[in-house]
Interface confidence: medium
């Protein structure tokens, strides 16, 4: 019995760099650290068969299946996939191990299945089996986290019922306002489900998995802060848990906090209090109001009162179904070529939306910012002064919303010309949409001042290129102008641009462009 070779099977995940689809033994550019696939000898199989751990791959992901063979001498190999033989070119690494690779670029359903690698070395023959399947991301979910009180402890548990199991982290900040942005040094992240430190200024819990990241903020009323001009509003769907934290700081411990819903004290079991001294020995008290599963009758004004602070309220609204409220009428904007401008959508939504901005079939990330009045705003400034149609799309679990914007850039026309045997056409994308004139250049009119009015056909908005209007003007050929130079001019309030065309037999026409401001 020959000594079996030492074999290592690895999976390398690649960051897609838009390489073409197909199988190849060259390497994509960017790769992650290899993952060991085990490669155990398969029991009760005829011949020597190694089986690698099953590989699950996301649609469109790029991977390399790789086998490292520690066996003396040369090796030859053959890949077989769905009864087709595939080229195999082993090479040797720095440790003189044979390396055989199969690269799968942009994984598709057709590339899923069993990959067999037959290796022949000087000593022995053996087979390695890889099973590659597409990960069923349709079953994936990422749900917004929610809070629960930990049994018998003054602590909150963060729960996100998601597939695959998400990583849960608390995002804590003790500063005010802008300094609590995610990347700020004031922000502390704790990758754990249970949080005991509940006295911070800003407390959020985030869950992340392959589908992204979702966060929930612990709704807080701070009695030491000046109340907002509009009453803070909290939306929840029937059956969701309600958590509101009331926080107050005082010079000593001689004060208490209470919660009321519509002037009635909350029932026992719907609140709990914690307190601590801050470093300067002032007392911080927090009083949580919570309902494990809200019903319609939990709607109302929740008021936190203190014996030493002015009381503050929040309006809790329980809805049957999520919503997105915003005006969906399309909006048109006209700006100068170097004018700073952002599209913006103001909306009120629950649950929080996922959104995208789209232009020219390309999607851009969408950021949202909460406003004091309960509304949120999303702005898009990355238009690079490209005219056209921009689309804002938002959705949550229960609602969808789309809003169209048209951006027009004020600029003088640029003229392009084309000609055929029977007509000449000029096109311009200047804005405001230009007007056209055609002029004939002749001995009588060397400066091309003789205007042509016969046979001219203007189309104000010929074709829409991602919302960008293009104006055109066509001159039908007549005997009177055949063989002459003609000039088409497009003009608007910002200037004029012309193109000169020689009208003769069909073929490539010389175009001479004039720019007249």
């Amino acid at each position: 019995n020959q000594d079996l070779p030492v074999i290592k099977c690895v999976l390398i995940n690649h960051k897609n760099n838009d390489s073409s689809v197909g199988k190849s033994s060259s390497y994509p550019m960017v790769s992650e650290s290899p993952e060991d696939l085990g490669c155990a000898l398969r029991p009760q199989s005829s011949g020597t068969v190694y089986e690698a751990a099953a590989v699950e791959v996301d649609v469109s992901a790029s991977i390399t299946l790789q086998v490292l063979v520690d066996a003396p001498g040369n090796i030859s190999c053959l890949w077989v996939f769905k009864h087709s033989s595939l080229n195999c070119q082993p090479h040797f690494d720095l440790q003189n191990r044979g390396v055989v690779s199969m690269v799968i670029l942009k994984m598709t359903e057709t590339q899923a299945g069993e990959y067999l690698l037959f290796i022949q070395s000087e000593a022995t023959n053996y087979t390695i089996l890889f099973t590659v399947s597409i990960r069923n991301t349709l079953l994936y979910t990422l749900r917004r986290p929610y809070f629960r009180k930990m049994e018998n402890q003054d602590a909150l548990v963060c729960i996100s019922e998601s597939v695959p199991e998400p990583i849960v982290e608390w995002v804590l900040c003790d500063s005010q306002g802008e300094s609590c942005k995610e990347e700020s040094p004031a922000v502390v992240k704790k990758e754990e489900k249970v949080l005991h430190e509940l006295f911070g200024t800003d407390i959020r819990c985030c869950a992340r998995n392959e589908l992204g990241r979702e966060c929930t903020r612990l709704f807080t009323i701070d009695l030491n802060q000046t109340p907002q001009t509009t009453l803070p509003q909290l939306f929840l769907k029937v059956g969701e848990p309600l958590w509101i934290r009331c926080k107050a700081v005082h010079v000593n411990h001689g004060f208490g906090l209470t919660w009321e819903l519509e002037n009635k004290a909350l029932e026992e079991g719907n609140y709990f209090e914690m307190s601590t001294y801050s470093t300067n020995r002032t007392m911080i008290r927090i009083l949580f109001a919570f309902v494990s599963s809200v019903a319609r009758n939990d709607t109302g004004y929740y008021t936190c009162s203190s014996s030493k602070h002015p009381s503050q309220s929040a309006l809790v609204t329980i809805v049957e179904k999520g919503f997105i409220n915003a005006t969906n009428s399309s909006e048109d904007y006209e700006i100068d070529q170097y004018e700073e401008f952002c599209f913006s959508v103001r909306f009120k939504a629950y649950p929080q939306i996922r959104c995208t901005w789209t232009f020219s079939r390309k999607s851009f990330p969408c950021e949202q910012k909460g406003l004091d009045n309960g509304y949120s705003i999303s702005k898009f400034c990355n238009h690079k002064h490209q005219p056209g149609e921009y689309i804002f799309h938002a959705e949550n679990d229960d609602a969808q919303f789309t809003k169209m914007f048209t951006l027009n850039i004020r600029r003088k026309p640029q003229v392009l010309a084309e000609a055929s045997a029977s007509q000449a056409s000029c096109f311009s994308d200047g804005y405001p949409l230009p007007s056209w004139t055609w002029k004939k250049c002749s001995d009588k009119s060397p400066n091309c001042t003789e205007e042509i009015t016969e046979g001219v056909w203007n189309r104000k908005a010929n074709r829409k290129v991602f919302g960008q209007w293009v104006s055109s003007s066509t001159l039908n050929m007549s005997e009177a102008i055949k063989g002459f130079l003609v000039k088409c001019c497009a003009y608007n309030s910002l200037g004029t641009s012309c193109e000169t065309i020689l009208l003769n037999s069909p073929g490539p026409f010389p175009f001479i462009q004039d720019n007249i401001s």
Epitope: N152, H253, G256, F272, E273, S275, Y277, M283
Partner: antibody, heavy 120, light 107 residues
Framework: QVQLVQSGAEVKKPGASVKVSCKAS????????MDWVRQAPGQGLEWMGR????????TYVQKFQGRVTMTRDTSTSTVYMELSSLRSEDTAVYYC?????????????WGQGTLVTVSS | DIQMTQSPSSLSASVGDRVTITCRAS??????LNWYQQKPGKAPKLLIY???SLQSGVPSRFSGSGSGTDFTLTISSLQPEDFATYYC?????????FGQGTKVEIK
């Protein structure tokens, strides 16, 4: 004014359990933690643990874990401390003490104490 | 656990004397130290919290100082009602721990 009134003295046999009560008045019961401190005859003070009357959450000293249970009844503003599997070294005066903070405790009001004697 | 050590264990003094009791922590406890007075058969009474803050209703002859690991309770002019046992207690980290006590007796 703030008052913490404890139940009367108890004599127990080794292995038995004792439940001491502490009734609070003169302040908002759920706004202050209640701690339990004991003092063996002629000895110093020893902290046993605490309860948050608002939530019922408890923290126990490792030494007493598994033997001590602290509970509260918000309807009567009373906290209870039950100690099981009593041994002779548990003979002590047991005090409830109010503290305004969960993190940095100073005991600003104390009960009068309950003497628990464990003797066969 | 943080160990608290008081000294002296006991002292004799006369009415009008200035009395100083020290308390040392086994690690830094910032200013999270409290002082209590206990008379025989009675519950302890809070005198000083946060190392130097006088609890309301406590006479001003009592004062506290210190930070980190070393703390002092001072009675500027001993009165007859001050003869008692004094305990320090750290409130920096659980379990809260007390010093073994200092007994102030009449000389």
């Amino acid at each position: 004014q703030v008052q913490l009134v404890q139940s009367g003295a108890e004599v127990k046999k080794p292995g038995a359990s004792v439940k001491v009560s502490c009734k609070a008045s003169g302040y908002t019961f759920t706004s202050y933690y209640m701690d339990w401190v004991r003092q063996a005859p002629g000895q110093g003070l020893e902290w046993m643990g605490r309860i948050n009357p608002s939530s019922g959450s408890t923290t126990y000293v490792q030494k007493f874990q598994g033997r001590v249970t602290m509970t509260r009844d918000t309807s009567t503003s009373t906290v209870y401390m039950e100690l099981s599997s009593l041994r002779s070294e548990d003979t002590a005066v047991y005090y409830c003490a109010r503290t305004p903070s969960g993190s940095y405790s100073d005991f600003d009001y104390w009960g009068q104490g309950t003497l628990v004697t464990v003797s066969s | 656990d943080i160990q608290m050590t008081q000294s002296p264990s006991s002292l004799s003094a006369s009415v009008g004397d200035r009395v100083t009791i020290t308390c040392r922590a086994s690690q830094s406890i910032s200013s999270y130290l409290n002082w209590y007075q206990q008379k025989p058969g009675k519950a302890p009474k809070l005198l000083i919290y946060a190392a130097s803050s006088l609890q309301s209703g406590v006479p001003s002859r009592f004062s506290g100082s210190g930070s980190g690991t070393d703390f002092t309770l001072t009675i500027s002019s001993l009165q007859p009602e001050d003869f008692a046992t004094y305990y320090c207690q750290q409130s920096y980290s659980t379990p809260w721990t007390f010093g073994q006590g200092t007994k102030v007796e009449i000389k």
